[in-house]
């Protein structure tokens, strides 16, 4: 299957290059226009003559100038200027501003709280399964299995710190070696990036906003995936992370430090602990093959307990089974030994909603999952609305310039590195990369931050979360100190290595180009965003997990042909765009493949049919639901009953888009289908209205 949604009809003919007019591109001088048929399966479409650039990107000329979809939107200030207001108006405006700020902070607070509860919900739904992933003995010998377990567990518990702490406790108790733990940590790094991708899905109502938000969120995903793609084989071959971190750990004589500062948790915990409290040790116990833990509930019931250590006498089949030879006897009938037991006395119950319900973990998890997603979505809509009303005119200009402008020459290159430090610092303050990147996502969506600036902030966030882990490691008890510190350092150096790979040289900033490509695809086919999420965070890891369980022969047998095909497609793609003349005529484009293998259009039709049942009746209740509906059906008609989304398709129908010359695209490999839409007509819909 072709690597991009639609691999155009670029025909490598030096005299004439024809391409189906699919969508808007940056402006360019006029070129001649002609009509033709591209595919026997499609109706006549506009054909355009291309310049001899051998580009597979659509080249469209437009009579009116249309902005690049990646340009930040201008947030118009429709209000009265400050200077034109009277005293009463100024006071009113001031208090409105204060009110908006309080509302913004309030919604931001509940947004962060809902992320915390979302994590708890995921742990309740999939925590025990996550724990069982860890108890797989093949992790030791199979780094790929370790990687996917790291991804799956972190996705299931929605917290890299939880999965990392499980790994630490397993290493401390010699159930896992540091070598085997490193791929799991890499996987946890990938898994943690799902949170802001989910947050980006909440901005699905507005195409241009969604394009930016989704790209801004997935830049984190691509950075992590690409880093693993390069660094996992390097680690397996050289064990450089293990060696460097071992040298550091051995060269310092660390003393147990203070606990890592809980900065944001101090504010959010009083609220979240009223909703639900979890006993995180249960997941760790399951990971360590504790049979009793499998029947324990993750919902914490008793918050105040008294632990008393005592010795009890237990019977043993024979005196050979005694725990201690000196503490063994018979009463003439049974053989006895003494056993040290910890007796736990429950004193006070926890104060949270679910303490007296005695519901199964799955039920509590499902309830919390739905509620937290609704609150998350609601808060996000409100944050976007308030920011939209605040960030207008001069305010927007100042903020955008401050955030997105580089230092003056010759220090422009330093700006990105400062952004990395800011990202690391902010993540250290909020104690969670998920919270920081999730807060960043709507800002990228509404156009306050560019993806180019969000990228180093996200990389910094990756560093920030590891510094938190290092501090937590230094605070861990003696027996766990070495292993937890080494793992935290592995995590740190893995992210540093990733930054060195994909940041310093602008050419290597592949994650930005890939994220923009995905943003374009997802803006046109919004269902593809969900498809991407399921494929990359669930199906691929689960497939690798399943194949690994079947044995390395099966994994290699299936994996090698798949990897070979991917490499072949990528090489072919590169040759098609760079030097198609070296290829046989048939391979100079993707037309030799059936349409369903090179385009998302047929798939879109299938998805539309599948979700057709939702289209008239799914979302008449609330606008939050509407977003989910728009995402599923990718059809604005479905929300007409709630006046949530406008019918954009009708507005776009019948538009003839003239030819234009190739302009500077971020990614020459992005298909024309992915770029094929006019954001101008879809810039602001009622989807964000309340």
């Amino acid at each position: 299957m072709a690597p991009w949604p639609e691999l155009g009809d670029a025909q490598p003919n030096p005299d004439k290059y024809l391409e189906g007019a699919a969508g808007q591109q940056p402006t360019a001088p006029d070129k001649s226009k002609e009509t033709n048929k591209t595919d026997n399966t499609e109706a006549p479409v506009t054909k355009i003559e291309l310049l001899p650039s051998y580009s597979t990107a659509t080249l469209i000329d437009e009579p009116t100038e249309v902005d690049d979809p990646w340009n930040l939107p201008t947030l118009q200030d429709s209000g009265i200027k400050w200077s034109e207001r009277d005293t009463k108006g100024k006071i009113l405006c001031f208090f409105q501003g204060i009110g908006r700020l309080i509302l913004l902070l309030g919604f931001l607070y509940f947004f962060v709280c809902s992320l915390d509860i979302l994590s708890s919900a995921f742990q309740l739904v999939g925590g025990k399964m996550a724990g069982q992933f860890f108890s797989n003995s093949s992790i030791m010998s199979n780094p790929l299995l370790g990687l996917v377990i790291g991804v799956l567990v972190t996705v299931l518990v929605q917290s890299s710190s939880t999965s990392t702490s499980i790994v630490v406790s397993m290493v401390s108790s010699s159930l896992l070696t540091v070598r085997a733990a490193i791929p799991i940590i890499m996987g946890a790094n990938i898994g943690t990036s799902i949170t802001n991708t989910i947050v980006a899905l909440m901005q699905v109502g507005d195409r241009s906003e969604f394009r930016r938000a989704f790209a801004g969120a997935t830049v984190h995903d691509f950075f992590n995936w690409l880093s693993v793609l390069v660094l996992l084989p390097v680690e397996v071959a050289t064990h450089y992370l293990e060696i460097i971190t071992q040298l550091i750990v051995e060269s310092f004589h660390f003393k147990n430090g203070e606990d890592a500062p809980d900065l944001l948790k101090v504010i959010t915990k009083p609220f979240t602990k009223l909703i639900v409290q979890l006993d995180k040790k249960v997941i760790s116990q399951i990971a360590m093959n504790d049979e009793k833990a499998k029947n324990k509930s993750l919902v914490k019931i008793w918050c105040k307990t008294f632990t008393n250590k005592t010795q009890i006498n237990v019977t043993v089949p024979s005196t050979a089974n005694c725990t201690s030879p000196s503490l063994c006897w018979t009463d003439g009938i049974q053989n006895w030994t003494m056993k040290n037991v910890t007796y736990k006395e429950n004193i006070a119950k926890c104060q949270h909603i679910f303490v007296n319900f005695h519901l199964p973990d799955l039920a509590v998890g499902t309830i919390l999952l739905i509620l937290s997603l609704l609150v998350l979505c609601g808060c996000l809509i409100m944050i976007v609305k308030i920011l939209g009303s605040v960030l207008k005119g001069q305010v927007a200009t100042v903020i955008k310039k401050t955030i997105n402008t580089d230092f003056p020459f010759p220090f422009a290159w330093l700006t990105g590195y400062l952004a990395i430090l800011v990202g690391a610092g902010m993540t250290f303050i909020v104690q969670s990369s998920s919270v920081f990147t999730s807060a960043l996502t709507p800002l990228i969506g509404i156009g306050v931050i560019t993806i180019e600036r969000a990228y180093p902030l996200t990389l910094g966030s990756n560093i920030g979360t590891t510094t938190t882990a290092i501090l937590a490691a230094l605070a861990s008890p003696g027996n766990a100190l070495r292993s937890s510190l080494q793992i935290a350092l592995c995590h740190f150096f893995f992210n540093i290595s990733g930054i060195l790979l994909w940041y310093p040289i602008p050419f290597t900033r592949l994650p930005i180009r890939m994220a923009k490509g995905l943003g374009n695809i997802s803006a046109k086919y919004r269902w593809f965003a969900v498809f991407y999420l399921i494929i990359f965070f669930f199906l691929i890891p689960l497939t690798v997990f399943g194949l690994s369980l079947a044995g390395w022969r099966v994994l290699v047998g299936v994996g090698v042909p798949v990897v070979f095909i991917i490499i072949l497609v990528l090489c072919l793609r590169l040759l098609q765009s760079r030097c198609p003349r070296v290829l046989p005529k048939k391979l100079q484009n993707w037309n030799f493949l059936p349409l369903w293998m090179r385009s998302l259009k047929p798939w879109d039709a299938v998805v539309s049919k599948f979700t057709g049942c939702f289209q008239m009746r799914c979302c008449c209740c609330c606008r939050v639901c509407c977003r989910a509906c728009c995402l599923l059906c990718d059809c604005p008609k479905c929300c007409r009953c709630s006046k949530c989304c406008e019918d954009l398709e009708e507005a776009q129908e019948g538009q003839d888009v003239p030819v234009k010359a190739p302009e500077t695209f971020d990614n020459i490999t992005i298909s024309r289908e992915a770029q094929g839409e006019v954001p101008a007509s879809d810039s602001k819909t009622e989807c964000t209205a309340l």
Epitope: N313, T319, S326, I333
Partner: antibody
């Protein structure tokens, strides 16, 4: 106070059986094990076996198996030892003793003993 | 079965003397050893259990020690009422076995 009162002396013919009782008081009968120990004239102590009255689980010394039967009546807090196929060498004083179940305190209280004489 | 050997089989002592009775097990019994006192014509009485723990009401002059295979019962200052036969017993493994006894007499 703790008491283990045994039945009176018995004179038996070889090949016959004897049943000795041990009535207890002053403690929870079911929380203890009742052991039977014998002492031949001028000899040391020899363990016969024991019973847990709570669940009637018994254990006997190998050379008494098949000849001895230990029983307990919870309602009267009484333990019984029946020895069959009596031989002259079974002439001894038979003691019952209690042992706290699941505890390592050994036989902390004994009965006064029952003399069994086997002669033709 | 574990064989318990007691020595001496009898000993004669004076009031106020310090007396030591030894007991050796044929294999390691940890600390699962008890000492009993049997006065003439009476039933045995528990003195020491778990090798060194005095039973309730036993005078402090009686001390037990040892672990593994070698054990001792010490009477720090013999009193006239201590005239009796002393038995040691192992309860490490079934069957429970007793020593032959040590007869303590006053000179």
């Amino acid at each position: 106070q703790v008491q283990l009162v045994q039945s009176g002396a018995e004179v038996k013919k070889p090949g016959s059986s004897v049943k000795v009782s041990c009535k207890t008081s002053g403690f929870f009968f079911t929380e203890y094990i009742i052991h039977w120990v014998r002492q031949a004239p001028g000899q040391g102590l020899e363990w016969i076996g024991g019973i847990i009255p709570n669940n009637d689980v018994t254990n006997y010394k190998q050379n008494f198996r098949g000849r001895v039967t230990l029983t307990a009546d919870k309602s009267t807090s009484t333990a019984y030892m029946e020895l069959s196929s009596l031989r002259s060498e079974d002439t001894a004083v038979y003691y019952c003793a209690r042992w706290r179940n699941a505890y390592y305190s050994a036989m902390d209280s004994w009965g006064q003993g029952t003399t069994v004489t086997v002669s033709s | 079965d574990i064989v318990v050997t007691q020595s001496p089989s009898s000993l004669s002592t004076s009031v106020g003397d310090r007396v030591t009775i030894t007991c050796t097990a044929s294999q390691d019994v940890g600390t699962a050893v008890a000492w009993y006192q049997q006065k003439p014509g009476k039933s045995p009485k528990l003195l020491i259990y778990w090798a060194s723990t005095r039973h309730t009401g036993v005078p402090e002059r009686f001390t037990g020690s040892g672990s593994g295979t070698d054990f001792t019962l010490t009477i720090s200052s013999v009193q006239p009422e201590d005239v009796a036969t002393y038995f040691c017993q192992q309860y490490r493994t079934s069957p429970l076995t007793f020593g032959v006894g040590t007869k303590l007499e006053l000179k």
